[in-house]
Amino acid sequence: RRGAPAEDQDCGRLPDFIAKLTNNTHQHVFDDLSGSVSLSWVGDSTGVILVLTTFQVPLVIVSFGQSKLYRSEDYGKNFKDITNLINNTFIRTEFGMAIGPENSGKVILTAEVSGGSRGGRVFRSSDFAKNFVQTDLPFHPLTQMMYSPQNSDYLLALSTENGLWVSKNFGEKWEEIHKAVCLAKWGPNNIIFFTTHVNGSCKADLGALELWRTSDLGKTFKTIGVKIYSFGLGGRFLFASVMADKDTTRRIHVSTDQGDTWSMAQLPSVGQEQFYSILAANEDMVFMHVDEPGDTGFGTIFTSDDRGIVYSKSLDRHLYTTTGGETDFTNVTSLRGVYITSTLSEDNSIQSMITFDQGGRWEHLRKPENSKCDATAKNKNECSLHIHASYSISQKLNVPMAPLSEPNAVGIVIAHGSVGDAISVMVPDVYISDDGGYSWAKMLEGPHYYTILDSGGIIVAIEHSNRPINVIKFSTDEGQCWQSYVFTQEPIYFTGLASEPGARSMNISIWGFTESFITRQWVSYTVDFKDILERNCEEDDYTTWLAHSTDPGDYKDGCILGYKEQFLRLRKSSVCQNGRDYVVAKQPSVCPCSLEDFLCDFGYFRPENASECVEQPELKGHELEFCLYGKEEHLTTNGYRKIPGDKCQGGMNPAREVKDLKKKCTSNFLNPTKQNSKSNS
């Protein structure tokens, strides 16, 4: 369907592109000698960028540091030094720039303060960094300030002494609402969830922590859990891992009502050395990784039902190295239901897997057309594509970037990969899919940095090299043809590509430095592609595309999770602007139900290669370890439950006799007697 990529040659060359880009290339040289640069976008479609440069000299007793702050309001074409707005203070880079949610225009910078000071210091802006107010804090912050997603005036922070501090007026005044706090998170509706240690410390009390909730910013509290190891929020679910009574194992409990009632998740319990990890969550369901016992580096992915209680085994031997380690799990945001991850095979090599139906079935990635199988392949004609992600990067492979997809660039996935039986340690190439991962083509030879502009209308890439570079490549046809543009006559040591999050912009900033004998100078080049895409796209520039289409003859073609979607997509041959206001046009249509639209309810399972759910033999006639809402329950089921987010209608309805499964609640996680409310007086 798509040919091998070509660079320049006779490949749809764009007229006068060099002149057009030269007129739209803006250089900015930063007048400092900083060792590091961090960049943040402030707001959406505002064009405001903040750049913080830091220079640190570790002296014998203290370390001397200097920061500079720059601001652009034209997407990085010009920058103004605004260091004077923060009184030339040294900013602590480990806290980063805390940018407010949505388009609040709020920014918080945390300053370095001298050893004997009573508390920390922040600089706050609520006008997109035009002005800053210096505020001295009554505590030393341990973490970056966290904005409430619902109200950007509400902030929370943990202090170095484990106090939980809250501000209701964007950091002007602060109040300590609780001591001995280990972890705190904003929930919905300005709720704060946090764990507290009762006896010694967060580390010593792990597994004996209490989970608390405040719905009124610290006036009143409710203990919603005891014997807590950790907690997390995902989608509409609140999870807590809770220590068992009998031993050192722990189990996941789930709440969908902010901790008022809890149910025990039907997941394996884990021991001290193991972990749970929420890989992805939305309003419908959760992907949960459960680590294997022993230092195996892998575990099992389970997918939940709509309650977050019943879990189906999704993928075995899922690569996830030790707690807080590396996993390649990637949500392909450009197509619904698609995820890519890696498994660890028996021979300890690593293979990529993809699911198109939200974890229902996993398969290898199809071998790109016209590609050869590499040295990892036993059969030189049969192999698959393997994608490099976090694990490869952690293993120091020449992989400058993780896979990339954008919700508004429908179907496009870009990733480094190799073609064989397993992920290779050889130099990777860059591959692209234009159909959400069903088919792939080599896009660029060798490792590159890449980004998507104008909702997929332009793809930009820069070669990953340890030599200075001065060439940027771009494609207007989803990676089939590439043009090269020399953006400067003086090559720079490249450090990063920056474009506005959301992939709607037509500007790309190329960051790097020039180095002479003693000095290093930071420089950015911002290239605006607006004149390459001269006209706005019109109706004729778009074509209809059925997502997930694999068998056009079948009436169920394109049905995933009970419905199919037709998109209007830009033709590869159209060179025009989608524009900043582009909205993905899609037309959903409901599919008839089949057994594939149902998962097996608690106490049932699907035998290998079967579609019907049968009762688990080991559970027949037994009282089951099951706890719904913290009390004994009579659970009735017909063995099937609609897959979360599945919208099928009619068709097959797996009706069968409804069984009354008497379940015994074995969780004393939240005994009503243990629930108490407290006032902060």
């Epitope: 195996t296 021979d347 120091k396 064989g420 039986d421 992920i423 290779s424 340690v425 050889m426 130099v427």
Partner: antibody, heavy 122, light 107 residues
């Protein structure tokens, strides 16, 4: 065929550093990790770490962190292992060894250099 | 780290006889185990990987078995060139670790 040829024997004083080279031929040097393994006289084998010749990335065994540096020169397909602050118990034969083409959590070694004897003695 | 223990430390066998070498891991290494042969003054040579797969050019008299924590290398009929030290190595997790070796000597 794959060949790994190492530099000659070295005698060093305690506190000094030694740099052993390993020249690769017969395959694409940047396509495979290079590991270093040592063997003290009459003892077993001990893994020291790896270097990815392509990116220059390294991973050292805990025991050698801070003392070992692995580098490479891709233009001459050569990997280097430098061990500093030498002690008498660093006396050993040092081997370079090549892994396979797969990225693995840990590796076995298909091809070995002939070894370089490093003697640390005052 | 995973500790690999080989037994016996020395094995005396007559040429033409069968030799059985054992290797035990302190925790499961699945089938991620390799065997090497080393002769005096030489580098180790890969014999078996994946617990039971013979490396290229290795004679059929060498075979490996086992999984998890218990592994065996069998030399069905010892030839004169087989008298050497044999090492097992796990490649399940970092760091890769070797057993202390079994010396196979002429009886």
């Amino acid at each position: 065929q794959v060949q790994l040829v190492q530099s000659g024997a070295e005698v060093k004083k305690p506190g000094a550093s030694v740099k052993v080279s390993c020249k690769a031929s017969g395959y694409t040097f940047t396509g495979y990790y290079m590991h270093w393994v040592r063997q003290a006289p009459g003892q077993g084998l001990e893994w020291m770490g790896w270097i990815n010749p392509n990116s220059g990335g390294t991973n050292y065994a805990q025991k050698f962190q801070g003392r070992v540096t692995m580098t490479r020169d891709t233009s001459i397909s050569t990997a280097y292992m430098e061990l500093s602050r030498l002690r008498s118990d660093d006396t050993a034969v040092y081997y370079c060894a090549r892994g396979g083409p797969q990225l693995r959590v840990a590796e076995y070694f298909q091809h070995w250099g002939q070894g370089t004897l490093v003697t640390v003695s005052s | 780290e995973i500790v690999m223990t080989q037994s016996p430390a020395t094995l005396s066998v007559s040429p033409g006889e069968r030799a059985t070498l054992s290797c035990r891991a302190s925790q499961s290494v699945s089938s991620n185990l390799a065997w090497y042969q080393q002769k005096p003054g030489q580098a180790p040579r890969l014999l078996i990987y994946g617990a039971s797969t013979r490396a290229t050019g290795i004679p059929a008299r060498f075979s490996g078995s086992g999984s998890g924590t218990e592994f065996t290398l069998t030399i069905s009929s010892l030839q004169s060139e087989d008298f050497a030290v044999y090492y097992c190595q796990q490649f399940r997790v970092l760091p890769p670790t070797f057993g202390g070796g079994t010396k196979v000597e002429i009886k």
